[in-house]
């Protein structure tokens, strides 16, 4: 059965400065391969959060990622600015072999409003 | 750097117990997965209990019920407790970082148990 | 589970290249590292990801996949490669870590 990647909120507000978690779950971890965070669609697309050990600025996991059972990948966005807004996806991939890594399945998106505090 | 140093091995007879430890420290101990890895003199490397950030625990099948692995996140220590022993579990004991998805990058200089009459 | 099967040995002159496949996973369940062990030492991970190279480890030891066989490449191989190298895979369909028989490096 295909893998569904589920993000339960269409949007969310947050005041900038605060603090905001976007949710996002899927129904299996097969095929092997990872989890990323991406802001807007396409070739502009920017990645905001990556479940392969780096480092992010302000964002982190939400729930216990080192699980091997885990399916919980949402995130937390600390110190929200202005330059946050925007749609967020949460997106399965299967690891490539020699290759780029294969998207095979995105969430629908959570777009997320800043607020002026 | 990362460093992980076993200790707790030693001579003990069959039934007996013994708990091994392992001090972690050059990077965040409570981020990370971690795993305990056996090899019998002359032998291959087994796998044989694994362990999330939250403390979920895993284990390879030879050892079910007899070895139990546990972790201290405040002292940065991770534990194998090893009951009712047998001469099959003489080895060199290594515990070792996972990576994201359950790998191992870096390893312990290991601390030999014996199991003898 | 699964069985990892590797060669039990490999023989390479110095400056040549020296494959160690490991096959047995499936490539739609498990991934692959290569670890490196010298007599009486602790093992060292010279590949994870199946292809990914700790940066502490030379650029000459790479990994790559096909099907269900990965494959442990050393170009240029040196006297100070002579050692076992043991395929991992973790499985995530069952949560399990398994390890290949180990292949024995021969710098001839």
């Known amino acids: 059965t295909e893998v569904k990647v589920t993000q339960p909120e269409k949007s969310v507000s947050v005041a900038a400065g605060d603090s905001t978690i976007l949710n996002c779950t899927v129904t299996s971890l097969l095929p092997v391969g990872p989890i990323r965070w991406y802001r807007g669609v396409g070739q502009s697309r920017l990645l905001i959060y990556s479940f392969t050990g780096e480092h992010f600025p302000r964002i982190r996991n939400v729930s216990d990622t080192t699980k091997r059972n885990n399916m919980d990948f949402s995130i937390r966005i600390s110190n929200v600015t202005p330059e946050d807004a925007g749609t967020y996806y949460c997106v399965k991939f299967q690891r490539g072999s020699s290759e780029p890594d294969t998207e095979i399945q995105s969430g629908g998106g959570t777009e997320v409003y800043v607020l002026a505090k | 750097d990362v460093q992980l140093v076993e200790s707790g091995g030693g001579v003990v007879r069959p039934g007996e117990s013994l708990r091994l430890s392992c001090e972690a420290s050059g990077f965040t101990f409570s981020s990370n997965a971690m795993s305990w890895v056996r090899q019998a003199p002359g032998k291959g490397l087994e796998w044989v209990a694994g362990i999330s950030s939250g403390s979920d625990t895993y284990y390879g099948d030879s050892v079910k019920g007899r070895l139990t692995i546990s972790r201290d996140n405040s002292k940065n220590i991770l534990y194998l407790q090893m009951n009712s022993l047998t001469a099959e579990d003489t080895a060199v004991y290594y515990c070792a970082r996972e990576t994201w998805n359950h790998l191992f990058d870096y390893w312990g200089l290991g601390t030999l148990v014996t199991v003898s009459s | 589970s699964y069985e990892l099967t590797q060669p039990p040995s490999v023989s390479v002159s110095p400056g040549q290249t020296a494959r160690i496949t490991c096959s047995g996973g499936?490539?739609?369940?498990?991934?692959y590292a290569w670890y490196q062990q010298k007599p009486g030492q602790a093992p060292v991970t010279v590949i994870h990801s199946d292809d990914k190279r700790p940066s502490d480890i030379p650029e000459r030891f790479s990994g790559s996949s096909s099907g269900t066989t990965v494959t442990l490449t050393i170009s240029g191989v040196q006297a100070e490669d002579e050692a076992d190298y043991y395929c991992?895979?973790?499985?995530?369909?069952?949560?399990?870590?398994?390890f290949g028989g180990g292949t024995k490096l021969t710098v001839l």
């Open positions: 991992g895979g973790y499985d995530g369909r069952t949560y399990i870590n398994t």
């Open positions: 499936d490539y739609y369940s498990t991934y």
